[in-house]
């Protein structure tokens, strides 16, 4: 079973190093999350061809996934820590009814799905601890998260099959963004 | 096989323009970050921009800061460098290059780069 | 900004020397490291990502380490191909910056 980061032999400090800082233990948390969404893409993209759709079509997709923008402050230009970790925060919390949905999703790499899940959540905690300025983050409805749980669960297969792909592309790009952004802070 | 072709480099007055392309085959390029590279005359390299897939997200160095500004369009499989307020310092082969892809996620590494193209700022 | 320090500058050495090349950062950089090859008038190649990983097609007696702030590239037994300059890349946090080169050539 895939474990987190700081729970196999490898993540564990050498006596003569120094034990992870916050920042650090984010960093490379942020990884493993990255790496378990890489075996889950190889899976759906050797499944089906939406690996090589075109952005287009993809956005023809009318799913509501958190986006970074210049305007969250994560970005090179006009970086700002606060705004930006709100960003990420919510982004997350956003995300975490998609990857409910992809729990039963995949075959060879259900576990892999699982990790990402529970990864995501000790990886909110890990930020909201570093967050000053709590009051500007909003959790989503579990209301509507649950009527969007049932929505996407209805879907055709074709459609099934592209919602997963733009999660993982679209969670990949988000965590990207914000593993760059939290390195400048 | 992968292919990196970059145009639009030449001869220009300080204070004046050009913009670089560069064309990518080979790969799917939407899914790949892009930077671009110079080396002056006879110098090291350095790292110049880079631009990520689709989130827009962009970096500069500090030298070219405000100046230039880094774009694709995905649909014509092409990465641009916008130069304006050209400085002699800026006289420099500039490469264009992709960053490592599949499943490396995190780590920067360019592992295939145009042939370069030459842009000279001189009066 | 996080500084890059490479040494030696120049390295004088003779085919068949196992050769090393260090790079500092000023900051950690994780595992965030890449080393490439440039051959005069060639464009560079990429050898090392990931701090250690090796790059695919690159040959065994190429190999990098560290992890944080130091980082070492070495070449087990020189051949003549080998004879380049050499250039660390951290690609933690922007600007990403390049080392200022190695020039490994003949004594």
């Known amino acids: 079973a895939p474990v987190l980061p700081g729970e196999d032999s490898k993540d564990v400090a050498a006596p003569h190093s120094q034990p992870l800082t916050s920042s650090e233990r984010i960093d490379k948390h942020i990884r493993y999350i990255l790496d378990g969404i890489s075996a889950l893409r190889k899976e759906t993209c050797n499944r089906s061809n939406m690996c090589e759709s075109s952005k287009e079509a993809l956005a023809e997709n009318n799913l509501n996934l958190p986006k970074m923008a210049e305007k969250d402050g994560c970005f090179q230009s006009g970086f700002n820590e606060d705004t930006c970790l709100v960003k990420i925060i919510t982004g997350l919390l956003e995300f975490e009814v998609y990857l409910e949905y992809l729990q039963n999703r995949f075959e060879s790499s259900e576990e892999q799905a699982r990790a990402v899940q529970m990864s995501t959540k000790v990886l909110i905690q890990f930020l909201q601890k570093k967050a000053k300025n709590l009051d500007a983050i909003t959790t989503p409805e579990p209301t509507t998260n649950a009527s969007l749980l049932t929505k996407l669960q209805a879907q055709n297969q074709w459609l099934q099959d592209m919602t997963t792909h733009l999660i993982l592309r679209s969670f990949k790009e988000f965590l990207q963004s914000s593993l760059r952004a939290l390195r400048q802070m | 096989q992968v292919q990196l072709v970059e145009s639009g480099g030449g001869l220009v007055q300080p204070g004046g323009s050009l913009r670089l392309s560069c064309a990518a085959s080979?790969?799917?390029?939407?899914?790949?970050?892009m930077t671009w590279v110079r080396q002056a005359p006879g110098k090291g390299l350095e790292w110049v921009s880079s631009i990520y897939s689709f989130s827009g997200d962009t970096a500069y160095a500090d030298s070219v800061k405000g100046r230039f500004t880094i774009s694709r369009d995905n649909a014509k499989n092409t990465l641009y460098l916008q130069m304006n307020s050209l400085k002699s310092e800026d006289t420099a082969v500039y490469y264009c290059t992709r960053n490592l892809g599949g499943v490396v996620v995190t780590t920067n590494g360019y592992d295939y780069w145009g042939q370069g193209t030459q842009v000279t700022v001189s009066s | 900004d996080i500084q890059m320090t490479q040494s030696p500058s120049s390295l004088p050495t003779s085919l068949g020397d196992s050769v090393t090349i260090t790079c500092q950062a000023s900051q950690s950089i994780s595992d965030e490291l890449s080393w490439y090859q440039q051959k005069p008038g060639q464009t560079p190649k990429l050898l090392i990502y990931?701090?250690?990983r090796l790059q695919t097609g690159v040959p065994s007696r190429f190999s990098g380490r560290g992890s944080g702030t130091s980082f070492t590239l070495t070449i087990s037994g020189l051949e003549a191909e080998d004879l380049a300059t050499y250039y660390c890349?951290?690609?933690?946090?922007?600007?990403?910056?390049f080392g200022q080169g190695t020039k490994v050539e003949l004594k």
């Open positions: 080979g790969f799917t390029f939407s899914n790949y970050y």
């Open positions: 990931g701090a250690s």
């Open positions: 890349l951290q690609g933690y946090s922007w600007p990403f910056m």
